[in-house]
Amino acid sequence: YDFTNCDFEKIKAAYLSTISKDLITYMSGTKSTEFNNTVSCSNRPHCLTEIQSLTFNPTAGCASLAKEMFAMKTKAALAIWCPGYSETQINATQAMKKARKSKVTTNKCLEQVSQLQGLWRRFNRPLLKQQGSSDYKDDDDKHHHHHH
């Protein structure tokens, strides 16, 4: 899915209002320095691509995130604010329902959610330049200038 045409500010609002709190709940009791952040993103569409991948794609050692509250709210936000997103997810959702039987919090899942927090932080506060400024470092953001 190409996240270029999402309403980034509405997704940001959904994150700050609810999703972030669910991520904090999931990570409660974990030190912020416990995991090294190895996943990064360069602009808002790229951040959403990485967020979708980490949230919904099963990985070795962590196959259960899609059923978490933050994941369901993420899915809802993307479905509402990214045109055509929900249609692309129908097959993936059916596959997830078959794959996930129970919610298990593993250390690998905690590490993955720590990565997610970093991606969301980057998505929310990209260092966009002032209007009228021409010193963009990132061409993708040049065409999607949503102020924080």
Epitope: E9, K10, K12, A13, Y15, L16, S17, S20, S32, T33, F35, N36, N37, S40, S42, Q117, G118, W120, R121, R122, F123, N124, R125, L127, L128, K129, Q130, K137, D138, H147, H148
Partner: antibody, heavy 120, light 111 residues
Amino acid sequence: EVQLVQSGAEVKKPGSSVKVSCKASGFTFSTYNMHWVKHAPGQGLEWIGAIYPGNGETSYNQKFKDRATLTVDKSTSTAYMELSSLRSEDTAVYYCAREDDYGEGYFDVWGQGTTVTVSS
Amino acid sequence: DIVMTQSPDSLAVSLGERATINCRASESVDNSGLSFMHWYQQKPGQPPKLLIYRASNLGSGVPDRFSGSGSGTDFTLTISSLQAEDVAVYYCQQINTDPLTFGQGTKLEIK
């Protein structure tokens, strides 16, 4: 403990440059926007700019864009602000600050400040 | 640039009384239903400390005598019962649009 430790006070001549450092510890430096703020005597706070250590991307207040340069050294978790062509109006306390955990945009951790005095 | 104007510039309030500081933005700092306005407290020789984020949310470890309200262009910081340790300069800050801008500051003293 999450903290930012800045370099010591500097006295500089007009026309020269100063480079202030800000060493981060207790958090994953590369994933937080780092900001610089000026506080001149008897004045309010003024945002200079910000840098994302993950890729070195910067955003500047146009007022400082020509004279301020923000850089980072990820290997030492240190942010730098260099100010060139110094003049008396640059006499101030300069703070580095970390943006919050969640992308709210507030500054939740501040350095102790570095006093820069520009005098002939 | 969004200009933040605080009023009053200075304020003297008796201990235990209510203190109110206003901040007006030259244009709205709201986005998608959220107000991107923060309040800081700065004491002499110290860096600023976050008090209120996003107009009305209390910062971590901040006493509940502090509160914030407002949306759009008009915002208020209230201290319900002034304590001696609240003597400081208070700043509002908008982060909705670059460049990030602060108010000129309000100096709060004890009457």
